[in-house]
């Protein structure tokens, strides 16, 4: 009988040790979770504050409403210009309105003067249709003024306050456009 009692006592003690071990593990796990939680919260706060402090457009880009614009300092053909913009998470400029056209031409006057700048407009050589790269057609007031005589592919560019057309293989400056970062407050 005594042996039976002592065996039960030992089993109970073993159970207790296991439970203590489990509790210790749980406490350790909880502490680890709390630390991770603190780390996550700190990380999120840092991210939010850095996003809060950062400007809606990258350095050397100009903001207007929801858009950021980059005016290149190098010349390239139309295709390379678009590739350069795409590398920056942007595309060649797509002019949506007269207001945007006025902003662009006004900004260009201040920055560089009367040069040629590729925009994201290309003409289908077979149908003669002008398209922005998202596939939309330019509004009637924003069609290139002169139809190029070139038998080659034709693309659109801005000069002074006009939208014109030229062989896509000619070298020009270019303008990239992307969405401005929106403040979360």
């Amino acid at each position: 009988k005594l042996l039976q009692v002592s065996t039960i006592a030992m089993q109970q003690q073993e159970k207790l040790i296991q439970q203590e071990r489990a509790l210790l593990n749980f406490t350790e796990w909880k502490r680890s979770c709390a630390l991770q939680m603190k780390y996550c919260q700190a990380f999120m706060q840092n991210s939010l504050s850095s996003a809060h402090n950062s400007s809606p457009c990258p350095n050397n880009w100009i903001q207007n409403r929801e858009s950021c614009y980059y005016v290149s300092e190098i010349w390239s053909i139309w295709h390379t210009s678009q590739e350069n913009c795409l590398k920056e998470g942007s595309t060649l400029l797509q002019i949506e309105s007269k207001e945007e056209m006025d902003f662009i031409t006004g900004s260009l006057r201040k920055i560089k003067g009367s040069y040629d700048y590729w925009v994201g407009l290309s003409q289908d050589g077979h149908s003669g249709r002008w398209l922005w790269q998202d596939g939309s057609s330019p509004s009637p007031g924003l069609l290139p003024a002169e139809r190029s005589q070139s038998a080659n592919q034709v693309c659109g560019y801005v000069k002074s306050n006009s939208l014109l057309s030229s062989n896509c293989s000619t070298w020009k400056y270019f303008i990239c456009e992307k969405y401005a970062l929106r403040s979360s407050v």
């Epitope: 295709h79 050589g125 398209l131 790269q133 998202d134 596939g135």
Partner: nanobody, 112 residues
């Protein structure tokens, strides 16, 4: 450099269907309008359909409107042309095109 490789052409009966594919490489496919053009025997190149960089604004020449569907998969750098209710007049070599650059084309023949 820009490379466009068309496939999926063949001989089909009037009223039949085909799906053409165009595998693109050498440029950022997702950044450009893409088109299908065709050249019938003894004729010049004719624009068939175009689609915007993100898959929006599909447009078609009148003769294929309602029968052909242009689409793209930017993750796969591939342009498609689904051609339903084919007619003998659709017989041509079909090319996919980006900014005046074309592949070698794929032959589509509609005949009974």
């Amino acid at each position: 450099q820009v490379q466009l490789v068309e496939s999926g052409g063949g001989l089909v009966q009037p009223g039949g269907s085909l799906r053409l594919s165009c595998a693109a490489s050498g440029f950022t496919f997702s950044g450009y309008v893409m088109s299908w053009v065709r050249q019938a025997p003894g004729k010049g190149l004719e624009w068939v359909a175009s689609i915007g960089s993100g898959g929006g604004y599909p447009s078609y020449t009148d003769s294929v409107e309602g029968r052909f569907t242009i689409s793209r998969d930017n993750a796969k750098n591939t342009l498609y042309l689904l051609m339903d209710n084919l007619k003998p007049d659709d017989t041509a070599v079909y090319y996919c095109e980006m900014l005046g650059r074309r592949g070698q084309g794929t032959q589509v023949t509609v005949s009974s």
